[in-house]
Amino acid sequence: EEELQVIQPEKSVSVAAGDSATLNCTVSSLIPVGPIQWFRGAGPGRELIYNLKEGHFPRVTPVSDPTKRNNMDFSIRISNITPADAGTYYCVKFRKGSPDVELKSGAGTELSVRAKPSAPVVSGPAVRATAEHTVSFTCESHGFSPRDITLKWFKNGNELSDVQTNVDPAGKSVSYSIRSTARVVLTRRDVHSQVICEVAHVTLQGDPLRGTANLSEAIRVPPFLEVTQQSMRADNQVNVTCQVTKFYPQRLQLTWLENGNVSRTEMASALPENKDGTYNWTSWLLVNVSAHRDDVKLTCQVEHDGQPAVNKSFSVKVSAHPKEQGSNTAAENTGTNER
C-alpha cells in the first residue's frame, strides 16, 4: 500500500497508423500537490510527451479535463499516430517544488503502431533471357509494423519455392521493410505467364496485397526460320518465302540477300499474336530466273531483339527447265536457329 499510486492499467496498446491512441493513467491520491507529466521512454534521455503546466503539444489532448476539481484521471489521447510514435509511455507524478521532484511513475504502457505495408513492387531482370534459363524477380514492401509478415510468390497460380526473403532491420524498429527474391525457370510458353508477390500482414485483415510482373518483360523466344520456294511462274519468276515463327518480342528485322548482296530489309510491325503470345511473320521475294546466268543463292537473315543474326539460305537453280524446277532446286542452311 502506498500514499500515491500511479496506475497505468494497460501494459500495451496497439493502434493503427493514422488513428488515435488513448493512454490511460489514474492516480490514487491528489496529495501531495504536483503535476502529472507524460514521457516516452525512461531514464535521462526520455522525451516529454505532455505537460499540462507548460509547452505546446498539438497532437496530445487530455481525456478528462485536468483543471476539473478532484480529477484523478490523467489519461491522454495522441492523434494521428505514426510508426515513429511507437515506444513505452510513462505517466509520472511530480511533487511541487523548485524544481518539481519526481515522485512516482506508472508501470508504463507500450504503444505499438500497426502500419500497413506499402503495395509490393515487383521488378524483373534487366535483360531478357531465353527458355530454360533462370531469371530473378524481386519484391519489396516498406513501412509496416509489427515485424511479423508473410510473403509468398506465385507463377500462374502455383506457389514458387526457390525464394529468399529478408525483413529489415533485424532489431527493434518503428517500421520494417521486406525484400524477397524468387528464381524462375523460363519456358517457351511463358509469354503470357505472370508472377505474383503476395504480402499478408495483421493490418490487412486477411486481404493480402499483391504485386505482379509479366514474364513477357523478361523472356525472349527466338524465332524458327524456314525458307521455301513456290513453283516457278509462267513469267520465269520464282517466289521464295521466308517463314519466321514462334518469336517474342515482336522487335525483328528481316533482310533478304541475293548472292550475298542486300536485296531488301523489312521491319516487323503490327503482327497478329499467336495463342501463346508469340508472333509469326512471312516474307517473300520474287526472283527473275531469266535475269541470272548462274544459280542464285538467297539468304533470309533475321535479327531478333538485338541478338546476333540468324540466317537461312536457299539456292535457286537457273540451269534446269522450268517444269523441273521443283525437283532441281536445293535449299542450304547457313545459320543455326536458336531453339
Epitope: E1, E2, E3, V33, N71, L103
Partner: antibody
Framework: EVQLEESGPGLVAPSQSLSITCTVS????????VNWVRQPPGKGLEWLGI???????DYNSALKSRLSISKDNSKSQVFLKMNSLQSDDTARYYC????????WGQGTSVTVSS | DIVLTQSPASLAVSLGQGATISCRAS??????????MHWYQQKPGQPPKPLIY???NLESGVPARFSGSGSRTDFTLTIDPVEADDAATYYC?????????FGGGTKLEIK
C-alpha cells in the same frame, strides 16, 4: 490498522537538542511520507516538516536551520532532531502520516526548561 | 508563507442549528484544478482528526453533516446540523506551498 506513536524525552534544557522517535505500524515508510507537527500549550498547530517515502525531506523554512528529519525503513521509525531549543519550543509534538495527514499519533509533550 | 486566517475565532451554536467557519488564504492554494485546503477537528487532549480534504471531499467515517466548499483563497467548513459531539476546535490547513501552514483555529461551542 494504521498507528503512529511518538516517544520523546519530556524535558529538555534550554540550548540543548531534542530527539523524538515516531514508530509506525500498518503501513510502510517506503510508500508514505511522515510529517512532524507541533502545538504549543493552548495554541494552534505548526507544521515542522516531512520526510517522503523516497527519503527526501521538506522543512518549514523558519526552522530549517535547527531541524533534521530522518528515518529507518526497516525499523518503521522516523526521527525528529531539533537543535538549540528555547522555551518557545515547548509544545506537544505529533507525527502524522502522509501529505494528507490522515492518521496522527497521540503526540509527545516536550517542555524546555532548566 | 501562505497565511490562513480563520473566522470567527470562536462561535456558539445551538444544538441542531448550522455552523459555518471561514478560512481565507493570503494567496491562492489552487493547483492543477484542485484546492489544496483541508479541515481538521481537534478535541482537548486529542490529536487533530481529518474531516475534509481537497476543500470539499469528506474523509471516510466522517458524517455527512460536515461539508467543505470554496476555491483559490476563500473556503468554508459547514456543520449542519450540529451535534453535542461537534464541540471542538477546527483548523484549516494548506499544503499547496511550502511551508505548509494551519489557520489559527475556530473554537465551536454548542449551546
Amino acid at each position: 490498522e494504521v498507528q503512529l506513536e511518538e516517544s520523546g524525552p519530556g524535558l529538555v534544557a534550554p540550548s540543548q537538542s531534542l530527539s523524538i522517535t515516531c514508530t509506525v505500524s500498518g503501513f510502510s515508510l517506503t510508500g508514505y511520507g511522515v510529517n512532524w507537527v507541533r502545538q504549543p500549550p493552548g495554541k494552534g498547530l505548526e507544521w515542522l516538516g516531512i520526510i517522503w517515502g523516497d527519503g527526501s525531506t521538506d522543512y518549514n523554512s523558519a526552522l530549517k536551520s535547527r531541524l533534521s528529519i530522518s528515518k529507518d525503513n526497516s525499523k518503521s521509525q522516523v526521527f525528529l532532531k531539533m537543535n538549540s531549543l528555547q522555551s518557545d519550543d515547548t509544545a506537544r509534538y505529533y507525527c502524522a502520516r502522509a501529505g494528507k495527514m490522515d492518521y496522527w499519533g497521540q503526540g509527545t509533550s516536550v517542555t524546555v526548561s532548566s | 508563507d501562505i497565511v490562513l486566517t480563520q473566522s470567527p475565532a470562536s462561535l456558539a451554536v445551538s444544538l441542531g442549528q448550522g455552523a459555518t467557519i471561514s478560512c481565507r488564504a493570503s494567496e491562492s492554494v489552487d493547483s492543477y484544478g484542485n484546492s489544496f485546503m483541508h479541515w481538521y477537528q481537534q478535541k482537548p487532549g486529542q490529536p487533530p482528526k481529518p474531516l475534509i480534504y481537497l476543500a470539499s471531499n469528506l474523509e471516510s467515517g466522517v458524517p455527512a453533516r460536515f461539508s467543505g466548499s470554496g476555491s483559490r483563497t476563500d473556503f468554508t467548513l459547514t456543520i449542519d446540523p450540529v451535534e453535542a459531539d461537534d464541540a471542538a476546535t477546527y483548523y484549516c490547513q494548506q499544503n499547496n506551498e511550502y511551508p505548509w501552514t494551519f489557520g489559527g483555529g475556530t473554537k465551536l461551542e454548542i449551546k
